[in-house]
């Protein structure tokens, strides 16, 4: 799916209002709040692509994230603010149901959610930079690594 035509402001509002709370609650109490962020994104559509992949594509050691409340809310948000997103997900959901279930490793899921938090923060930052860029034409839009 191409996330270029999404309403990024509305997605940001949904994230800040609900999704972020669920992601952070998922991580609360864990010793590993300092996982290295190995996944990054360069612009808003790219961030949403990575977020979609990490949230809904099962990995060998963390197969269950798509069932979490933050994932369900992410799916609803993308369906609401990204034209045509729902249609593309019908086939993907059917394909996922056919995959065999794997053992969930809590630590791996925590690591994945930590990565997700980083991607969402980056999505918000790129959104802020874009808005700043529109208001100040002399603003140099260089990513902070």
């Amino acid at each position: 799916y191409d996330f270029t035509n999404c309403d990024f402001q509305k997605i940001e509002a949904d994230y800040l209002r609900t999704i972020s709370k669920d992601l952070i609650t998922y991580m609360s109490g864990t010793k590993s709040t300092d996982f290295n962020n190995t996944v990054s994104c360069s612009n808003r559509p790219h961030c949403l692509t990575e977020i979609q992949s990490l949230t809904f594509n099962p990995t060998p050691r963390c197969a269950s994230l798509a069932k979490e409340m933050f994932a369900r809310k992410t799916k609803a948000t993308l369906a609401l603010w990204c034209p045509g997103y729902s249609e593309t997900q019908i086939n993907a959901t059917q394909a996922m149901k056919k995959r065999r279930k794997r053992k969930v490793t809590t630590n791996k899921c925590l690591e994945q959610v930590s990565q997700l938090l980083g991607l969402w923060r980056r999505f918000i930052r790129t959104l802020l930079k874009q808005q700043h860029h529109h208001h100040h034409h002399d603003y140099k839009d260089d990513d902070d690594k």
Partner: antibody, heavy 120, light 109 residues
Framework: EVQLVESGGVVVQPGGSLRLSCAAS????????MHWVRQAPGKGLEWVSL????????YYADSVKGRFTISRDNSKNSLYMQMNSLRTEDSALYYC?????????????WGQGTTVTVSS | SSELTQDPAVSVALGQTVRITCQGD??????ASWYQQKPGQAPILVIS???NRPSGIPDRFSGSSSGNTASLTITGAQAEDEADYYC????????????FGGGTKLTVL
């Protein structure tokens, strides 16, 4: 003042039903996960159930799964526990407790508890 | 589900330092929180996460963690510290659940 006040505890026969309530005040209720924790006479603390800040997720200890239902009404700053098919081993002091906010996970506010006695 | 194990009873001389421990697989992944409960009273949170002390809790209470063991240390125990102490954490076998230790009765001599 941040406060939780439980009510609804009574004597009930085995197999009976009961609904506990917990009224919250002094904080933004819908920012927090909420828990029910119980303590049988002379015993330790036993976690019973939790509900997410918006009520979208609920989880239960194996000992009460399928019999107890946790819920909340954020507009009324209230937490509830519907208890069905009660057993004698459910007799305990039931506390509601405020759960995590952001990275903090301790239950930092507790009510004084309400007593449930299951006896024939 | 995971289990947290505590010593049933520990004693300390007034003014001395005591350490109460909590062991369990979930503590490799999650921090423990510690609660003090006096007879007839509701539990009070004394330590959460890495070593977070809520306001109103004396600084003689501190927490630490290593491997699958969490510790609550009271440096210079006072008579009013005599109570039951419980640890809890998230359950590593299902991180949506919560597990409590069996409790430690602290006696201040």
């Amino acid at each position: 003042e941040v406060q939780l006040v439980e009510s609804g505890g009574v004597v009930v026969q085995p197999g009976g039903s009961l609904r506990l309530s917990c009224a919250a005040s002094g904080f933004t209720f819908d920012d927090f996960t909420m828990h029910w924790v119980r303590q049988a006479p002379g015993k330790g603390l036993e976690w019973v159930s939790l509900i997410s800040w918006d009520g979208g997720s609920t989880y239960y200890a194996d000992s009460v799964k399928g019999r107890f239902t946790i819920s909340r009404d954020n507009s009324k700053n209230s937490l509830y526990m519907q208890m069905n098919s009660l057993r004698t081993e459910d007799s305990a002091l039931y506390y509601c407790a405020r759960g995590p906010y952001y990275y903090f996970y301790g239950m930092d506010v507790w009510g004084q508890g309400t007593t449930v006695t299951v006896s024939s | 589900s995971s289990e947290l194990t505590q010593d049933p009873a520990v004693s300390v001389a007034l003014g001395q330092t005591v350490r109460i421990t909590c062991q369990g697989d979930s503590l490799r992944t999650y921090y423990a929180s510690w609660y003090q409960q006096k007879p007839g009273q509701a539990p009070i949170l004394v330590i959460s996460d890495k070593n977070n002390r809520p306001s109103g809790i004396p600084d003689r209470f501190s927490g630490s963690s290593s491997g699958n063991t969490a510790s609550l240390t009271i440096t210079g125990a006072q008579a009013e510290d005599e109570a039951d102490y419980y640890c809890n954490s998230r359950d590593s076998s299902d991180n949506h659940l919560v597990v409590f230790g069996g409790g430690t009765k602290l006696t201040v001599l």
